[in-house]
């Protein structure tokens, strides 16, 4: 069987010879050199060599426990002649003993940490950690103690844990923001002869809201023209706050003053300025100066600092409204006028009125924008704004005329304004009714009396208020002895009826019927229209088979006998 115990070896051996580890030995070894000892495993043949005859093991190199604390090797004892193992292969351990050859090393060369300003004494800042590569299970080589080398009286460190805490009351960021603390970690429990390492901790005081906003001046004055539309910026005011970030954010508001309804203040988030803007239209002629009270406040307030006073400040803003020469103002936004279509030239339609709103009340002259009245149908009295016709109108040509009137200050022609005029042309009965289409019909030779051969329709360009009412009749010259009659249907239509039984196309192939159409308006308008009736041969169903076309080719002299 094998005869050995666990081998121990001191690290960092500095002797000139190889370091003796121990002896492998089998009780089968007769000491005659018949056995060969073989070493395999961690570092065999390199770090550890064996005398194959005696089993003595030596370390060839300086060993570092921190690099490798334990080596696991295997031993064989073999009969040199046969190769036959005299013992089972066995595993053994070489354990490296620790010396204090490593200083504590911080996990970071430089730590960065933050803590709120004005923190209570003992507030946690950061924990630093140093590790010592030496053996923590043996002696105090790896027992680390922390101390502060730089950074008192502001900060302290817990010796066992490395926790850094605040040590001074009311540390004010606005006074000093950055601190550099140096911490030492020493092994051997901090005793003499221990190895040490240091780290730097850069501590930044973070801001808290312990400063109110302050206006640098108590009064601001701005000017703005009365023409400034709502939303126009007038000026900027800025309060300063010694804090930073959201603790320095400022909200501006108008709290008082006669301009409370006329102006707004908005906060520019980028610059933290208050922008005074116009809220409602200004009028120099009504009010020339406004006074506002503007307040700057922190939206986020820390209750524990309220004892320092209110976190707001106010300033007075004086706004001077400047006069602006304004264009004339019409009495209406638009005018609607009416005129009959039979109005004579120079007939007055109506009038427009415009006034200079300025205190000067400059006189105004009127004109028609000719781009809107190219045909010069209308004109205006430049002095009093009366609108009149300069040409005859026709409702049936154009019902509405849309023109623009310009009012210009006589003393300052650059100041002008415009207003739309909508002129409606009213209807007059000045058009006679007429046939809706050209009528050409036929009658069968074998037609019976009182047979309807055509229905007549009429149209009228006029547009009477109560609607059209047409009447139809044969012209007086054709009324007696006519071969056809006109029947007025009293619904703005009429029918042509046969008056006898049978027509002979060889005797008379075409009839021309003059029909009088009248309207029912004032003054009555009428016209005469002619209906052509051809006599045709028809089948027994009344369908036309053939007609003479002479009436179309030679219409003269054919109206007689209708």
């Amino acid at each position: 069987s094998w005869m050995w115990n666990q081998f121990f070896l001191l690290e960092e051996y500095t002797g000139s010879d190889y370091q003796y580890v121990g002896k492998l030995h089998s009780d089968q070894d007769r000491g005659d050199g018949s056995l060969k000892y073989i070493l395999s495993g961690d570092g065999a043949g390199d770090l550890f060599i064996i005398n194959e005859n005696t089993g003595d093991i030596q370390a060839t190199k300086r060993l570092d426990r921190e690099e490798k604390p334990v080596y696991i090797l295997r031993a064989q004892a073999i009969n040199r002649r046969t190769g036959r193992p005299v013992e089972p292969e066995s595993e053994f351990i070489i354990k490296i003993h620790d010396i204090n050859d490593n200083e504590p090393i911080f996990t970071k060369e430089v730590y960065t940490a933050t803590v709120p300003e004005m923190s209570d004494v003992g507030t946690f800042v950061v924990q630093v950690t140093a590790t010592d590569a030496d053996d923590p299970t043996y002696g105090n080589s790896a027992k680390v103690v922390y101390s502060i080398l730089q950074g008192q009286p502001y900060f302290s460190v817990e010796s066992e844990t490395g926790i850094i805490k605040t040590a001074l009351l009311n540390m004010d960021r606005e006074n000093r923001e950055q601190y550099q603390v140096v911490i030492q970690a020493k092994d051997m429990g901090g005793q003499m002869g221990g190895l040490s390492g240091t780290t730097t901790v850069n501590i930044t005081l973070t801001d808290v809201n312990d400063n109110p906003p302050r206006f640098p001046q108590s009064t601001y004055q701005f000017k703005t023209p009365e023409s400034s539309p709502p939303g126009t910026p007038i000026g900027r005011i800025k309060a300063s706050d010694a804090d930073v970030g959201e603790n320095a954010e400022i909200e501006y508001s108008i709290t008082d003053g006669e301009g409370l309804d006329m102006f707004d203040v908005i906060t520019d988030q980028e610059t933290q300025e208050g922008i005074i803007t116009v809220k409602k239209l200004l009028d120099f002629e009504k009010k020339k100066v406004y006074t506002l009270k503007v307040e700057a406040s922190n939206p986020y307030v820390e209750p524990r600092f309220l004892y320092l006073g209110p976190f707001k400040d106010s300033a007075t803003v004086r706004i001077v409204v400047e006069d602006v020469d304004e264009p004339p103002v019409f009495s209406k936004l638009a005018y609607i006028l009416q005129i009959r279509e039979d109005a004579q030239i120079n007939t007055t339609i109506g009038s427009v009125t415009a006034q200079d709103p300025d205190a000067a009340r400059n006189p105004v002259k009127y004109s028609v924008d000719r781009h809107t009245d190219m045909d010069r149908i209308f004109n205006i009295d430049s002095g009093n704004g009366s609108i009149f016709t300069s040409k005859l109108l026709d409702r049936e040509t154009l019902l509405w005329h849309n023109i623009t009137v310009i009012a210009t200050e006589i003393n300052n022609p650059k100041q002008s304004s415009r207003v739309p005029l909508y002129i409606k042309v009213l209807d007059v009965n000045d058009n006679a009714p007429e046939f809706a289409e050209f009528y050409e019909t036929f009658v069968c030779e074998k037609a019976k009396a009182d047979q309807l051969i055509q229905t007549l329709h009429a149209v009228d360009k006029d547009d009477p208020y109560s609607g059209h009412q047409f009447s139809f009749s044969l012209a007086p010259e054709a009324a007696s002895g006519s071969n056809f009659t006109i029947q007025d249907n009293k619904d703005n239509t009429a029918g042509i009826l046969t008056r006898k039984n049978g027509y002979n196309r060889h005797e008379m192939s075409t009839y021309l019927l003059p029909v009088v159409i009248s309207d029912n308006d004032y003054p009555v308008q009428s016209s005469t229209g002619t209906v052509t009736v051809r006599v045709c041969a028809c089948d027994h169903h009344g369908n036309m088979q053939s007609c003479h076309a002479e009436a179309l080719i030679h219409p003269t002299g054919l109206s007689t006998g209708a």
Partner: antibody, heavy 117, light 111 residues
Framework: EVQLVQSGAEVKKPGSSVKVSCKAS????????MHWVRQAPGQGLEWMGD????????HYTQKFKDRVTITVDKSTSTAYMELSSLRSEDTAVYYC??????????WGQGTTVTVSS | DIQMTQSPSSLSASVGDRVTITCRAS??????????MHWYQQKPGKPPKLLIY???NLESGVPSRFSGSGSETDFTFTISSLQPEDIATYYC?????????FGGGTKVEIK
């Protein structure tokens, strides 16, 4: 470089003896056993015996125990194998071989021994 | 004595083929995880050359296409891809017990 150089071929009469030498170089002669193996024409390998040069301890196969003698001269790093009472069936190539943990890692070039009347 | 039975006694294979030779010992040649079986190559007119020792260990300088395995009584020698220069007779040998004995040999030829 390890080398084993054997003596030259021998022709012997039946009943006589033969002594074959094997000179070693390129290693520590005393640290390794020396073995003798023979091979009859067209036949396989046959182990005859071995010697520990440091103590002259020998082992022989039963077949040759009475006829074979293995010796060494440490001063010249030479091993010898003597076979007596030769017969025709002893005609073979005789090899010396270095032994290391039961294996033959280096061999001599072989010596042909012919037994003929 | 431990008898070594090697098979086949001869074989013919093509270049690139996988060749396997077996050797059976009449009793176990293994102890404490060490297998005292070794393999040799012998070319005509030349002494044998050690290829594999202790059943599976490749001797220094021997090509990796040669390998060995096995334990106790049954052992295998393999050429993974036969090459023309591998034409030879191959022997197994045990050193477990005196007298040390060889297998009868396997002659390997190229088809």
């Amino acid at each position: 470089e390890v080398q084993l150089v054997q003596s030259g071929a021998e022709v012997k009469k039946p009943g006589s003896s033969v002594k074959v030498s094997c000179k070693a170089s390129g290693y520590t002669f005393s640290n390794y056993w020396m073995h003798w193996v023979r091979q009859a024409p067209g036949q396989g390998l046959e182990w005859m015996g071995d010697i520990d040069p440091s103590h002259s301890e020998t082992h022989y196969t039963q077949k040759f125990k009475d006829r074979v003698t293995i010796t060494v001269d440490k001063s010249t790093s030479t091993a010898y194998m003597e076979l007596s009472s030769l017969r025709s069936e002893d005609t073979a190539v005789y090899y010396c071989a270095r032994g290391d943990l039961g294996r033959f890692d280096y061999w001599g070039q072989g010596t042909t021994v012919t037994v003929s009347s | 004595d431990i008898q070594m039975t090697q098979s086949p006694s001869s074989l013919s294979a093509s270049v690139g083929d996988r060749v396997t030779i077996t050797c059976r010992a009449s009793e176990s040649v293994s102890i404490h995880g060490t297998h005292l079986m070794h393999w040799y190559q012998q070319k005509p007119g030349k002494p044998p050359k050690l290829l594999i020792y202790a059943a599976s260990n490749l001797e220094s300088g021997v090509p990796s296409r040669f390998s060995g395995s096995g334990s106790e009584t049954d052992f295998t020698f393999t050429i993974s891809s036969l090459q023309p220069e591998d034409i030879a007779t191959y022997y197994c040998q045990q050193s477990f017990e005196d007298p040390w004995t060889f297998g009868g040999g396997t002659k390997v030829e190229i088809k």
